[in-house]
């Protein structure tokens, strides 16, 4: 009985398949380039299994290598708008603790209205990820156009 | 002996690592914006381990959180072509059962000829995913330019 | 005791969670379109757990289905630069052994300065992946702008 229970628990507890997919809640006040995220089944298809939100920023709860992915679409945007407002840039990084602050992933919109990318990176318990959108265009809040997530891959 | 067998089966059967990578088969008739997919080793590097194809659309066989990814490249395309034919949009969503119909991921081509993105989303057994390409440009059928896949991540 | 040990080893040894994330080292000499990669904790946040580097190219050590992902950003680039130097193309493929040579993933920059994509593909022990950048623009060596990685997903 205990063996079967250990088998069942293995993937989620022992392996620690922490995962989160977030949707945009709101942008920050004028001098704050951060995007503020939200997640949970009541909101639609977003969720947090392991990681937590701390004032709209994603905090990691388990050490490991993670796949981080993001898509951001600019609101009411055309290629003309995007090029006129260049540079509009999205950066994902560890923003706290300050000792581990680093940019993990960075993209510019140039003449496009959507950026999407992903990468593998080591993250530690307590790391908080921030997503900074610099520029004068608003991100779309549509849940199929703007989203941000992480997936634990291995220790 | 039985224990060793259980160990071997754990990742694929108990954990249910369903996965599929598809290549474009054809586009739909005029009023049907859906892309029709195909997969299997006889076709090259595409495959289905768990999910199935139902009339060219991908049907999920196991509940869980999935990483869905897609890349679509437009055929005989330049930035001029793409901007001239704007809006050309790609949307991935659950199209059946109707009660669960929702758009999961959406991108426009603007002045580019390729879109690529990925996201985590909960899917249930029986969900069918459709990929809708709206616009007047054809997607490339080259297997390294247009592909669509899912990967089971956790329950 | 031995059972507990087997449990601990299961994810990394039995399941073989090979994973690598690389940063750009340098471009090749003039007639060589390949990008040369580097990885390891001394270099920052890049790493190799399983796969190895062979003269800057990634060599697979375990059979399986892999998620391959890449982002490449062009150096000192604007949409004008990118369109002027079209076609600038990035292709990821198996380059050795020659009998398995194939293009896995291909994107053009058109009017953008960054490409990013990912796909699932079967890879075999000994497969070497090459990333070919054709065109007259340099790839950025910033670690948050240009990176390449693989993640073992299942046998």
């Amino acid at each position: 009985q205990r063996f079967a229970q250990a088998q069942q628990q293995l993937p989620l507890e022992s392996l620690g398949w922490d995962v989160a997919e977030l949707q945009l809640n709101h942008t920050g006040p004028q001098q704050d380039p951060r995007l503020y995220w939200q997640g949970g089944p009541a909101l639609g298809r977003s969720f947090l299994h392991g990681p937590e939100l701390d004032k709209g920023q994603l905090r990691i709860h388990r050490d490991g290598i993670y796949m981080v992915h993001i898509q951001v679409t600019l609101a009411i945007c055309s290629s003309t708008t995007a090029s006129r407002h260049h540079p509009t840039t999205l950066a994902v990084g560890i923003c706290s603790p300050a000792s581990r602050s680093i940019s993990l992933l960075r993209l510019s919109f140039h003449q496009g209205c959507t950026i999407a990318s992903q990468r593998l990176t080591p993250l530690a318990r307590g790391d908080t990820l921030c997503t900074n959108l610099t520029g004068t265009l608003l991100p779309s809040r549509n849940t199929d156009e703007t989203f941000f997530g992480v997936q634990w891959v291995r220790p | 002996q039985r224990f060793a067998q259980a160990q071997q089966q754990l990742p694929l059967e108990s954990l249910g690592w369903d996965v599929a990578e598809l290549q474009l088969n054809h586009t739909g008739p005029q009023q049907d914006p859906r892309l029709y997919w195909q997969g299997g080793p006889a076709l090259g590097r595409s495959f289905l381990h768990g999910p199935e194809l139902d009339k060219g659309q991908l049907r999920i066989h196991r509940d869980g959180i999935y990483m869905v990814h897609i890349q679509v490249t437009l055929a005989i395309c330049s930035s001029t072509t793409a901007s001239r034919h704007h809006p050309t949009t790609l949307a991935v969503g659950i199209c059946s059962p109707a009660s669960r119909s929702i758009s999961l991921l959406r991108l426009s081509f603007h002045q580019g000829c390729t879109i690529a993105s990925q996201r985590l989303t909960p899917l249930a057994r029986g969900d069918t995913l459709c990929t809708n390409l709206t616009g007047t440009l054809l997607p490339s059928r080259n297997t390294d330019e247009t592909f669509f896949g899912v990967q089971w991540v956790r329950p | 005791q031995r059972f507990a040990q087997a449990q601990q080893q299961l994810p990394l040894e039995s399941l073989g969670w090979d994973v690598a994330e690389l940063q750009l080292n340098h471009t090749g000499p003039q007639q060589d379109p390949r990008l040369y990669w580097q990885g390891g904790p001394a270099l920052g946040r890049s790493f190799l757990h399983g796969p190895e580097l062979d003269k800057g190219q990634l060599r697979i050590h375990r059979d399986g289905i892999y998620m391959v992902h890449i982002q490449v950003t062009l150096a000192i680039c604007s949409s004008t630069t990118a369109s002027r130097h079209h076609p600038t193309t990035l292709a990821v493929g198996i380059c050795s052994p020659a009998s398995r040579s194939i293009s896995l993933l291909r994107l053009s920059f058109h009017q953008g300065c960054t490409i990013a994509s990912q796909r699932l593909t079967p890879l075999a022990r000994g497969d070497t992946l090459c990333t070919n950048l054709t065109g007259t623009l340099l790839p950025s060596r910033n670690t948050d702008e240009t990176f390449f990685g693989v993640q073992w997903v299942r046998p």
Epitope: - | - | L24, I76, T136, L138
Partner: antibody
């Protein structure tokens, strides 16, 4: 091997214009910016401007205040630099130059130079 | 415009000795993980010849006694063992942005 061959020396009056040509061979003319750099006698090097022959787009050094015009003829793989409203301080050797592989503004290949003398 | 300042203006070095020329940019010429700084050699009556590109890359066919180093705003061209044929004027140049600009030149002679 890329070769850039320039037109011969010119003597011009102040206020007139000069047009120097640069014929490229041995490479893909339309894929690389062609730059023009000048060097006054006993002085250093000064970048004047560039053209991307593929689409005719130009970039100019603002120091020349609209006096320089760079053009290209893809059919003959030739670039041209015209400098107007000449004055004595425009007396210099004028070079065309381009990169060998990466299309950034460092210069692997140079023409032999064209001496333009402005004198009344 | 980025101003490039070379030092010294002239330099006399014995044959077989090391020669070092410095170049300072008025702002950083580094971007995207590269330093967009290049070095040229010019002999009388000839066009300049590219020696070093992107701060530390030796151009094909250039003897390996020439080397470049530096990042950001401060760069150095070094000739490890001066030969008679190295007598020339040396220029640094940036290509970080338009317009690219050159240093004023350093005249290298044999002592």
């Amino acid at each position: 091997e890329v070769q850039l061959v320039q037109s011969g020396a010119e003597v011009k009056k102040p206020g007139s214009s000069v047009k120097v040509s640069c014929k490229a061979s041995g490479g893909t003319f339309s894929r690389y910016n062609m730059h023009w750099v000048r060097q006054a006698p006993g002085q250093g090097l000064e970048w004047m401007g560039a053209i991307f022959p593929g689409n005719g787009e130009t970039s100019y050094n603002q120091n020349f205040k609209g006096r320089v015009t760079i053009t290209a003829d893809k059919s003959t793989s030739t670039a041209y630099m015209e400098l107007s409203s000449l004055r004595s301080e425009d007396t210099a050797v004028y070079y065309c130059a381009r990169n060998s592989y990466y299309d950034y503004a460092w210069f692997t290949y140079w023409g032999q130079g064209t001496l333009v003398t402005v004198s009344s | 415009d980025i101003v490039m300042t070379q030092s010294p203006d002239s330099l006399a070095v014995s044959l077989g000795e090391r020669a070092t020329i410095n170049c300072r940019a008025s702002k950083s010429v580094s971007s995207s993980g590269y330093s967009f700084m290049h070095w040229y050699q010019q002999k009388p009556g000839q066009p300049p010849k590219l020696l070093i590109y992107l701060a530390d890359n030796l151009e094909s066919g250039v003897p390996d006694r020439f080397s470049g180093s530096g990042s950001g705003t401060d760069f150095t061209l070094t000739i490890s063992s001066l030969q008679a044929e190295d007598v020339a004027v040396y220029y640094c140049q940036h290509s970080r942005e338009f317009p690219p600009t050159f240093g004023q030149g350093t005249k290298l002679e044999i002592k």
